[in-house]
């Protein structure tokens, strides 16, 4: 039994400093340190085939695929790419390992694919497979998974037509409601495409790739559960597959399940049944209703009936195009500085939306929760009592939706002052928006109580900073006022704040900040 050679596959990324294009096995370039690609024998394959982790390369990047072989004696090799043989010149490194390289300069679409390296040593022959793909995030997609019945088996296949190829996993849970949250101990994940165990309470399939993760839940009617107050509703687009599972548990096997659409039994071939005994010897039956590609006439009330349970229905609605239903009128809120408050959007949508909350050009993660009435809700509480404009944006590939919120925080004004050669300005951001007074400080009025009636120009809510209104007041200076101290005061229902300014001085001169509540 011959020991296999020790094979190491690495990727070397090069910083391009040349514009030539082609393949070579010795090319001077600035290189980053090699990245191991975990070369391993491909399981259950005929012959000795090693496989490297898939390599993703940016367009125009230059790389070297390299194999290091610990095997005695000489080696000969051949690269094959898209049925063409390419020159291969092995050499030996200081550790006396055979080194075979393939340089790909200025990566293009035509250079993506499978690179096969055939190596012949004195002891054995083997093949090394490199898969090189272009990392083009513009071409990346992540599609919601859907279900198909496995041919001649009572099993479901989960399919997600995504790029790069996603990792598909089943997420199974046998509890109810909250305990079936993703991170719950009750949740079991199974990283494979086919699922045979179809009796669980909650069954989801998820697909993940570089763009994130998308999941689809197997729509289920459980005849042993109390029906929801509102009829469950399932939306699908024309051409999508329909899957509904009806589940029932009874003390013995003496019961049957049937599906009807608008009081008509489903056609043969559009349902299948499975049954099993549970640990307490009760019988579990499930009956799937499925349509491989729905049309408008598949809309209606699907009713699951049992000879031993009350029947339950679901409304299946087939739409031509996805939708997002919600009121898009803008909403204004006024809260106290320490009041707990969350923005909330209630919507009905199909397919499921992706959403963001945005404030001050920053995006925040968006969580959505399904409600019993078929609606969903997204809340945003992380406003940290910052006043301004908050935007909820949702999209699902077919529809887009944007809703604006304004948050005002009730607080007394805070004044900022500055002076130039010809005028003095004060601004404040308190809410409700403040009103202004200007006072002159003089020998006659050391407490600055003498009103300045002229030359004042108020701009209420003139400047919007991320939706936050700012009020300002400007005093145009007369020659007679130069060298005097003046005081600007902003006041609203929560208090007053003042700043004192020395006129005819460049730059801001808030000597004293008065706070009069």
């Amino acid at each position: 039994n011959q020991d296999l050679p020790v094979i190491k596959c690495v990727l070397i990324n090069h910083k391009n400093n040349d514009s030539s294009v082609g393949k070579s096995s010795s090319y001077p370039m600035v290189s980053e340190s090699p990245e191991d690609l975990g070369c391993a024998l491909r399981p259950q394959s005929a012959g000795t085939v090693y496989e490297a982790a898939t390599v993703e390369v940016d367009v125009s990047a230059s790389i070297t695929l390299q194999v290091l072989v610990d095997t005695p004696g000489n080696i000969s090799c051949l690269w094959v790419f898209k049925h063409s043989s390419l020159n291969c010149q092995p050499h030996f490194d200081v550790q006396n390992r055979g080194v075979v390289s393939m340089v790909i300069l200025k990566m293009t679409e035509t250079q993506a694919g499978e690179y096969l390296l055939f190596i012949q040593s004195e002891a054995t022959n083997y093949t090394i497979l490199f898969t090189v793909s272009i990392r083009n995030t513009l071409l990346f997609t992540l599609r919601r998974p859907y279900f198909r019945k496995m041919e001649n088996q009572d099993a479901l296949v989960c399919i997600s037509e995504s790029v790069p190829e996603p990792i598909v996993e089943w997420v199974l849970c046998d509890s109810q409601g909250e305990s079936c949250k993703e991170e719950s101990p009750a949740v079991v994940k199974k990283e494979e495409k086919v699922l045979h165990e179809l009796f669980g309470t909650d069954i989801r399939c998820c697909a993940r790739n570089e763009l994130g993760r998308e999941c689809t839940r197997l729509f289920t009617i459980d005849l042993n559960q109390t029906p929801q107050t509102t009829l469950p509703q399932l939306f699908l687009k024309v051409g999508e597959p329909l899957w509904i599972r009806c589940k029932a548990v009874h003390v013995n096997h003496g019961f049957g399940l049937t599906w009807e659409l608008e009081n008509k039994a489903l056609e043969e071939g559009s349902y299948f049944e499975m049954s099993t005994y549970s640990t307490n010897r009760t019988m579990i039956r499930i009956l799937f209703a499925f349509v491989s590609s729905v049309a408008r006439n598949d809309t209606g009330y699907y009713t699951c009936s049992s000879s031993k349970h009350p029947s339950q229905s679901a409304l299946v609605t087939i739409v031509e195009k996805g939708f997002i239903n919600a009121t898009n009128s803008s909403e204004d809120y006024e809260i106290d500085q320490y009041e707990e408050f969350c923005f909330s959007v209630r919507f009905k949508a199909y397919p499921q939306i992706r959403c963001t909350w945005t404030f001050s050009r920053k995006s925040f993660p968006c969580e959505q929760k399904g409600l019993d009435d078929g609606y969903s809700v997204s809340k945003f509480c992380n406003h940290k009592h910052q006043p301004g404009e908050y935007i909820f944006h949702a999209e699902n590939g077919d529809a887009q939706f944007t809703k604006m919120f304004t948050l005002n925080i009730r607080r007394k004004p805070q004044v900022l002052a500055e002076a130039s050669a010809s005028q003095a300005s004060c601004s404040s951001d308190g809410y409700p928006l403040p009103s202004w007074t200007w006072k002159k400080c003089s020998d006659k009025s050391p407490n600055c109580t003498e009103d300045i009636p002229e030359g004042v120009w108020n701009r209420k809510a003139n400047r919007k900073v991320f939706g936050q209104w700012v009020s300002s007041s400007t005093l145009n200076m007369s020659e007679a006022m130069k060298g005097f101290l003046v005081k600007c005061c902003a006041y609203n229902s929560l208090g007053t704040s003042c700043e004192t300014i020395l006129l005819n001085s460049p730059g801001p001169f808030p000597f004293i900040q008065d706070s009069i509540s």
């Epitope: 690609l37 391993a40 898939t54 993703e56 898969t131 790739n209 994130g212």
Partner: antibody, heavy 124, light 107 residues
Framework: QVTLKESGPVLVKPTETLTLTCTVS??????????VSWIRQPPGKTLEWLAH???????SYSTSLKSRLTISKDTSKSQVVLTMTNMDPVDTATYYC????????????????WGQGTLVTVSS | DIQMTQSPSSVSASVGDRVTITCRAS??????LAWYQQKPGKAPKRLIY???SLQSGVPSRFSGSGSGTEFTLTISSLQPEDFATYYC?????????FGGGTKVEIK
């Protein structure tokens, strides 16, 4: 040369939070087909998988310890960090990080490289 | 969670002996099983992956077989450096679970 190196405190008091860092070299955490796991081994006992993280930030946790664990990564520093809250003497173990590799034909490259491990003792 | 039952928990053998270790999964895990060798004070080292594929650089006296729920690690002719503890790992289901270990000792 692929290496993974664990670092963190050797002694933790009960109820405290443990933070361990795994610094990797020789492969990239940016590679969509690479992931890093944390595994622990109490003295004289078997191995226990704790958590892993994929390049797209997808995370999975041990069901029994899920509420106490958080895994994260800093790709630019080639580091994966595990935090474990509310430490107890039964959490005394050698903590390892290990690599996972995915191939075109499946994710069968579980734990082909390991760190040397770091022994964490929980004691007051 | 999937239980991985490894047997025997320990085995005494001599150099040159054939040693067989078994791992049983509480449900079907297909080929998603790996075998590791661990020596005292060291990190585990992978020997076999995908139930029967030999890790590069591992001597061919180690072999793995099985699928579904029954798996076997065989050392065809025990060498002095093979005295260690061996663990199986299933990675078909979350959470990933290891067997209890088999200690191979010198007779």
């Amino acid at each position: 040369q692929v290496t993974l190196k664990e670092s963190g405190p050797v002694l933790v008091k009960p109820t405290e939070t443990l933070t361990l860092t795994c610094t990797v070299s020789g492969f990239s955490l940016r590679n969509a087909r690479m992931a890093v796991s944390w595994i622990r081994q109490p003295p004289g006992k078997t191995l226990e998988w704790l958590a892993h993280i994929f390049s797209n930030d997808e995370k999975s946790y041990s069901t029994s310890l899920k509420s106490r664990l958080t895994i994260s990564k800093d790709t630019s520093k080639s580091q994966v960090v595990l935090t474990m809250t509310n430490m107890d003497p039964v959490d005394t173990a050698t903590y390892y990080c290990a690599r996972i590799v995915g191939y075109g034909s499946g994710w069968y490259g579980y734990f082909d490289y390991w760190g040397q491990g770091t022994l964490v003792t929980v004691s007051s | 969670d999937i239980q991985m039952t490894q047997s025997p928990s320990s085995v005494s053998a001599s150099v040159g002996d054939r040693v067989t270790i078994t791992c049983r999964a509480s449900q079907d895990i297909r080929y998603d099983l790996a075998w590791y060798q661990q020596k005292p004070g060291k990190a585990p080292k992978r020997l076999i992956y995908a139930a029967s594929s030999l890790q590069s650089g591992v001597p061919s006296r180690f072999s793995g077989s099985g699928s579904g729920t029954e798996f076997t690690l065989t050392i065809s002719s025990l060498q002095p450096e093979d005295f260690a503890t061996y663990y199986c790992l299933q990675h078909n289901f979350y959470p990933l679970t290891f067997g209890g270990g088999t200690k191979v000792e010198i007779k």
